[in-house]
Interface confidence: low
């Protein structure tokens, strides 16, 4: 039987097939895909754009950063307010102080230690 390049279309991931010759074709890929048949998801992960130890996770035509627990936001640039997340982080009347990448306790009445429990 006669080979028709675009019937059926060899283009995957939503790519559009265009016949360029008797036996040749070209796939116009949707954003985020590449390859002669649009078979490859472009790895959008950048190298040093995720901040504060975030790990880049590739998506289709986008990327996100998997942040360590103390950081948040798309690029791990926003500090998590641990004092809001853990209302009882500081014991014995100590005051919680949020800091970049963590938190600290300001202890009172002779108490000490990381959480004012000593």
């Amino acid at each position: 039987s006669l080979y028709v390049p675009c019937a059926p279309s060899p283009c995957v991931n939503g790519g559009t097939c265009r016949q360029t010759g008797d036996f040749t074709f070209e796939c116009n890929c949707l954003p985020g895909f590449e390859g002669s048949t649009c078979e490859r998801n472009i790895d959008d992960c950048p190298n040093h754009r995720c901040q504060n130890g975030g790990v880049c996770v590739d998506g289709v035509n986008t990327y996100n950063c998997r942040c360590p627990p103390q950081w948040t936001g798309q690029f791990c640039t926003e500090d998590v307010d641990e004092c809001l997340l853990q209302p009882n982080a500081c014991q014995n009347g100590g005051t919680c102080a949020n800091r970049n990448g963590g938190y600290g306790c300001v202890c009172v009445n002779g108490w000490s230690g990381d959480d004012c429990s000593e």
């Epitope: 040093h48 798309q74 690029f75």
Partner: antibody, heavy 117, light 112 residues
Framework: EVQLVQSGAEVKKPGASVKVSCKAS????????IHWIRQAPGQGPEWTGY????????KFNEKFKGRATLTVDKSSTTAYMELSRLRSDDTVVYYC??????????WGQGTLVTVSS | DVLMTQTPVSLPVSLGGQVSISCRSS???????????LHWFLQKPGQSPQLLIY???NRFSGVPDRFSGSGSGTDFTLKISRVEPEDLGVYYC?????????FGGGTKVEIK
């Protein structure tokens, strides 16, 4: 289709400031870092800095720290680069480019800034 | 900053011929994440640079397979087989492994 459209050419006097805009379309603006790259006539491009549209966070080439300001307007999906205290060697083409693959995947058409007294 | 050195500076070619451009970095471009962030761009006269190859050997969307990239560590090569008129212009390598990102000085590919 991803597009970055920049503002037109500018002529400035030494010591003045210039603000170049870069209107992004065809993708989710907040999902990608926008870089600014400059190129002097007959020379290779030079990375100037980038801005994270979602948070407004910026990072600069040390060479331009203190003189370059990068901002975004998320409502109009536009990035801006302002350069102050212009000198004659700032007569270059400024490009905005979108991040991806650890590189610069899509570029604006360029904006020529001429600094002349 | 990482210095990127391209050779040759100028390269006269015949249409249909093959081209090889070298890019050498002043230090290894292997990133701690295991990737090597070395990329190739073409800047046609009066136009913006356009991405051809990212991370050594991956062709960007719509880039013909006559373009290929290779190399490792500090030595990288861009090859164009069967040069066509639209391939003429200045080719730049870029490293984005180390901060700040730095470009090579360019290789001008022109008709012999």
């Amino acid at each position: 289709e991803v597009q970055l459209v920049q503002s037109g050419a500018e002529v400035k006097k030494p010591g003045a400031s210039v603000k170049v805009s870069c209107k992004a379309s065809g993708y989710t603006f907040s999902n990608y870092v926008i870089h600014w790259i400059r190129q002097a006539p007959g020379q290779g491009p030079e990375w100037t800095g980038y801005i994270i549209p979602g948070s407004g966070g910026t990072k600069f080439n040390e060479k331009f720290k203190g003189r370059a300001t990068l901002t975004v307007d998320k409502s109009s999906t536009t990035a801006y680069m302002e350069l102050s205290r212009l000198r004659s060697d700032d007569t270059v083409v400024y490009y905005c480019a979108r991040d991806g693959a650890g590189s610069f995947t899509y570029w604006g058409q360029g904006t020529l800034v001429t600094v002349s007294s | 900053d990482v210095l990127m050195t391209q050779t040759p500076v100028s390269l006269p070619v015949s249409l249909g011929g093959q081209v090889s451009i070298s890019c050498r970095s002043s230090q290894s471009l292997v990133h701690s994440d295991g990737n090597t962030y070395l990329h190739w761009f073409l800047q046609k006269p009066g136009q913006s640079p356009q991405l051809l190859i990212y991370r050594i050997s991956n062709r960007f969307s719509g880039v013909p397979d006559r373009f290929s990239g290779s190399g490792s560590g500090t030595d990288f090569t861009l090859k164009i087989s069967r040069v066509e008129p639209e391939d003429l212009g200045v080719y730049y390598c870029l490293q984005s492994t180390h901060f700040p990102d730095t470009f090579g000085g360019g290789t001008k590919v022109e008709i012999k």
